[in-house]
């Protein structure tokens, strides 16, 4: 079934999709749509690229990576519960039967309730608020926004989440990366 990705309400969601252009600048049209990949192209298109540029997009949906190098991963800004569901990344390689279709399931969780302030406030200033996960494609930076105050018992939990995020990113990239040419 579809690979699953998670984000919290109010955060930006990241749905990875990559291809390797046959030559620099030799781009392939790509579409992103809400709902599983249909018979042709994408249903409910939210973003589309052509051989040169992004030629259609809707608010809150954008490509954060370098799509000219084949990183066509979708970022959805400020997600709500209504953004949950399956998304289609379709890499429209010319020729019969050549399209690559990826269905990615986005699960939106309610925002965590911010706990009351604790005495470990000084630690939070030193803790990075930008988590960078790297897979086969360009680095993806996930802005966590305002993190809750972190006490010492939460550090290992956050470290585990970061480790899981890195692992998930490696799995995602291996599953949604294709080479052309």
């Amino acid at each position: 079934s579809e690979v699953e990705y998670r984000a919290e309400v109010g955060q930006n969601a990241y749905l990875p999709c990559f291809y390797t252009p046959a030559a620099p600048g030799n781009l392939v049209p790509v579409c992103w749509g809400k709902g599983a990949c249909p018979v042709f192209e994408c249903g409910n298109v939210v973003l589309r690229t052509d051989e040169r540029d992004v030629n259609y997009w809707t608010s809150r949906y954008w490509l954060n990576g370098d799509f000219r190098k084949g990183d066509v991963s979708l970022t959805i800004e400020n997600v709500t519960l209504a953004d949950s569901g399956i998304y289609c990344c379709r890499i429209q390689i010319p020729g019969i039967m050549n399209d690559e279709k990826f269905n990615l399931k986005l699960v939106i969780k309610p925002a965590k309730v911010t706990p009351a302030p604790t005495r470990q406030r000084d630690f939070t200033a030193a803790f990075p608020r930008m988590l960078t996960t790297r897979g086969h494609g360009p680095a993806e930076t996930q802005t966590l926004g305002s993190l809750p105050d972190i006490n010492l018992t939460q550090i290992s939990t956050l470290a585990n989440e970061l480790r899981d995020s890195r692992l998930a990113n490696d799995l995602r990239d291996s599953g949604a990366t294709i080479r052309i040419g």
Epitope: S1, A36, C37, P38, F40, G43, I86, M97, D99, N103
Partner: antibody, heavy 114, light 107 residues
Framework: DVQLQESGPTLVKPSQTLSLTCSVT????????WNWIRKFPGNKLEYMGY???????YYNPSLKSRISIIRDTSKNQYYLQLNSVTTEDTATYYC????????WGQGTTLTVSS | DIQMTQSPSSLSASLGGKVTITCKAS??????IAWYQHKPGKGPRLLIH???TLQPGIPSRFSGSGSGRDYSFSISNLEPEDIATYYC?????????FGSGTKLEIK
């Protein structure tokens, strides 16, 4: 809602060319993909091909030498031409559109017979 | 071409009962399967796409499941208007192929 209506002859002689028209209302044929599918008397369904929003076409390889799909955007119609028909082409022909072949005409039944 | 082997070719069931139709693909079709209901004199009607996604307006009595090469389609709480022929379609690639159809009758 999208509506499709097939029209054309009901009887064609072997070796002749079949021409069918699909009239589309509720959508423009300059967006999406516009298909022909046929159903043989034994109930088998066969995908024949499409013409896309840009005018590009795709044909089932088994028909490639005989089939042509063209369009007239000013009339919002597209057409199926099938050359050198035989009795094996006797079928009900449907024009179809939509993300998952959601919209079908009611079909037009063609008999190939001398 | 990907072959879709659909079974049974016909079946008879009682009102209120449940029926299941299967389609087996000759290779993995990555869940890209749709199911259609066809009644005489009309065009086929899309019921389900991407294995289990119900088309808007289709009752939840209809369901689909499967993965890889093996897929099934079920109708529960059978009603008289369910009398029709049902087809599967694989759309994993442009060489779209349909199953041979299952004719459903009510006892």
């Amino acid at each position: 809602d999208v509506q499709l209506q097939e029209s054309g002859p009901t009887l064609v002689k072997p070796s002749q060319t079949l021409s069918l028209t699909c009239s589309v209302t509720g959508d423009s044929i300059t967006s999406g993909y516009w298909n022909w599918i046929r159903k043989f008397p034994g109930n088998k369904l066969e995908y024949m091909g499409y013409i896309s929003y840009s005018g590009s076409t795709y044909y089932n390889p088994s028909l490639k030498s005989r089939i042509s799909i063209i369009r007239d955007t000013s009339k919002n119609q597209y057409y199926l031409q099938l050359n050198s028909v035989t009795t094996e082409d006797t079928a009900t022909y449907y024009c179809v559109s939509g993300n998952h072949f959601d919209y079908w005409g009611q079909g037009t039944t063609l008999t190939v017979s001398s | 071409d990907i072959q879709m082997t659909q079974s049974p070719s016909s079946l008879s069931a009682s009102l209120g009962g449940k029926v299941t139709i299967t389609c087996k693909a000759s290779q993995d079709i990555n869940r890209y399967i749709a199911w259609y209901q066809h009644k005489p004199g009309k065009g086929p009607r899309l019921l389900i796409h991407y294995t289990s996604t119900l088309q808007p307006g289709i009752p939840s009595r209809f369901s689909g499941s499967g993965s890889g090469r093996d897929y099934s389609f079920s109708i529960s709480n059978l009603e008289p208007e369910d009398i029709a022929t049902y087809y599967c379609l694989q759309y994993d690639n442009l060489l779209f192929t349909f199953g041979s159809g299952t004719k459903l009758e009510i006892k």
